[in-house]
């Protein structure tokens, strides 16, 4: 990680992708520590952009503007050398977001995938972006970059992610950029949560008073397991959104969540999954599907008194 003997390592915290108006800490790690250092921005010339200022440990840059986007290097203090400074560090690209309209991000075949599968994340826009960038929340590495393919007034790029394992689960966003300002990125796409299933044992799903109910009768679906899941996720076939509830320890040592569906008006096939707070985007195997049938006079939909989660937010903790 530290590079060569006389080469410092420049890194950015929390990320190299910074929103306009945000702040980023640049750290120059040299010779097993954070010494005094100088920063350079590579604007065609290797001149200190910060007027020869010397920094200690880290430099907090911001509020950032589009002009801050670009490639940075540092030199560590080396008092007994000829120049007094080390060789230049690795290049570090800082990308500033919020400069163009946001693109859209889709998952094919979908955002809920089994461990080992591959997912295509397609970033697209009717803004003619030259490059698309894909970034996973909480990751400090550079985003993946692809050239946009333009057809019928739409620019798009397909990012292949896989084979999926827990480390790849999480919240993804994509950005676009135009040629003359490759590191001045667009506003972020709406977040897309990629969830990996099949990592833990399946919970069981049951219905109270039972899987066959009269129209208008209140129905509750209970998801439970001996595994100490923190959260249960309930999905209905054909519905984009899942509901989630905190698991509650029961006297019989199971962990359970009860999803009240309200007065039954419409049947459907339900599944539930368990997950742990530490890895909110890594889910258990699916429960066996539970078919809920409504006898009587079914209407077109089932009201949901519990607010379903949005298409994103799955990978955030429940507070």
């Amino acid at each position: 990680l530290m590079g060569g003997q006389d080469k410092p390592f420049l890194s950015a915290r929390p990320s190299t992708v910074v929103p306009r108006g945000g702040h980023v800490a640049l750290q120059c790690h040299y010779r097993r520590g954070f010494n005094n250092f100088m920063l350079y921005k590579e604007d065609r010339s290797h001149v200190p952009i910060f007027h020869g200022r010397i920094f200690q440990e880290s430099f907090i840059m911001g509020p950032v503007t589009p002009a801050h986007a670009g490639t940075y290097r540092c030199r560590g203090s080396r008092p007994h050398s000829l120049t007094g400074w080390s060789a230049p560090s690795n290049p570090l690209v800082i990308m500033v977001t919020g400069n163009h309209r946001k693109p859209s991000l889709l998952a094919h075949p979908g955002p809920l995938l089994k461990s080992g599968e591959t997912v295509i994340l397609q970033c697209w826009s009717d803004v003619m972006f030259e490059h698309f960038f894909l970034h996973r929340e909480g990751i400090s590495e550079d985003p993946s970059r692809l050239v946009g393919q333009i057809h019928d007034g739409v620019s798009k790029a397909n990012f292949s992610i896989g084979p999926l394992m827990p480390v790849l689960a999480g919240t993804y966003r994509c950005y676009g950029s135009v040629p003359h300002s490759p590191y001045q990125l667009s506003a972020p796409s709406d977040p897309l949560d990629i969830v990996i299933t099949g990592l833990y044992e399946k919970p069981s799903l049951s219905a109270q008073p039972g899987p066959t109910v009269q129209a208008g009768e209140n129905v509750t679906l209970s998801c439970s397991s001996w595994s100490s899941y923190d959260i249960y996720h309930l999905s209905r076939e054909g519905e984009a959104h899942e509901r989630r509830l905190r698991a509650v320890p029961k006297v019989n040592r199971t962990f359970q969540a009860d999803f009240p569906l309200g007065p039954a008006t419409h049947g459907g096939t339900y599944r539930c999954f368990g997950s742990f707070r530490a890895l909110p985007c890594v889910w258990s195997n699916s429960s066996d599907p539970l078919l809920v049938s409504v006898t009587g006079n079914p209407s077109s939909s089932w009201p949901s008194p519990t607010e379903p989660s949005s298409k994103s937010g799955i990978c955030r903790h429940l507070h």
Epitope: P66, G98, N99, H100, R101, D126, V127, M128, E130, V178, P179, H180, S181, A187
Partner: antibody, heavy 112, light 107 residues
Framework: QLVQSGPELKNPGETVKISCKAS????????MNWVKQAPGKGLKWMGW????????TYADDFKGRFAFSLETSASTAYLQINNLKNEDTATYFC????????WGQGTLVTVS | DIKMTQSPSSMYASLGERVTITCKAS??????LSWFQQKPGKSPKTLIY???RLVDGVPSRFSGSGSGQDYSLTISSLDYEDMGIYYC?????????FGGGTKLEIE
């Protein structure tokens, strides 16, 4: 398409403001470029304005007396030239997108 | 600034002839090059972007090629309506810069 305002005849020292009205696409999708063409001469890029953020960028020769602005609600970009000089006599074009995909018909400004 | 050197500055060609115009950049422009055609008293018309991509509606006799610093526009079979002035533009780096233009006339 991009439709520009009509020709202007001005005296030296005056100000001119040219408009460029966009239609048929989402205005904030594409930056708006401005290009100067003096009579019998080639094309010269003046700069661009980011229609999403409103930030203008000027080429060195067009810093100072030149100003790009937007009226996003009307899908219109403007070029204003202050303190006009004889050498500003030219046709001014607006063109949108990173590779100047579509152009306005041009506005002839005569300073005399 | 990146300098775009276009050649020839003017040329005569016959109908049906194959015509090539070249543009040389003072540094690598990563294929971020457009070609335009301008007729007298009209605004420029975009023919090609990203060095090789034909804009919708532009006749297929036009083609672009090149990479790095050297680029060319070819008209495979010259048509009467192709006369005009042709410009290249680099959009890799600000400020954008145009070539000086090539005046194409029919002989």
């Amino acid at each position: 398409q991009l439709v520009q305002s009509g020709p202007e005849l001005k005296n030296p020292g005056e100000t001119v403001k040219i408009s460029c009205k966009a239609s048929g696409y989402t205005f904030t999708n594409y930056g708006m470029n401005w290009v100067k063409q003096a009579p019998g001469k080639g094309l010269k890029w003046m700069g661009w304005i980011n229609t999403y953020t409103g930030e203008p960028t000027y080429a060195d020769d067009f810093k100072g007396r030149f100003a790009f602005s937007l009226e996003t609600s009307a899908s219109t970009a403007y070029l204003q030239i202050n303190n006009l000089k004889n050498e500003d006599t030219a046709t001014y074009f607006c063109a949108h997108g990173p590779w100047l995909a579509y152009w306005g018909q041009g506005t002839l400004v005569t300073v005399s | 600034d990146i300098k775009m050197t276009q050649s020839p500055s003017s040329m005569y060609a016959s109908l049906g002839e194959r015509v090539t115009i070249t543009c040389k950049a003072s540094q690598d422009i990563n294929v971020y090059l457009s070609w335009f055609q301008q007729k007298p008293g009209k605004s420029p018309k975009t023919l090609i972007y990203r060095a090789i991509r034909l804009v919708d509606g532009v006749p297929s006799r036009f083609s672009g090629s090149g990479s790095g610093q050297d680029y060319s526009l070819t008209i495979s079979s010259l048509d009467y309506e192709d006369m005009g002035i042709y410009y290249c533009l680099q959009y890799d780096e600000l400020p954008y810069t145009f070539g000086g233009g090539t005046k194409l006339e029919i002989e």
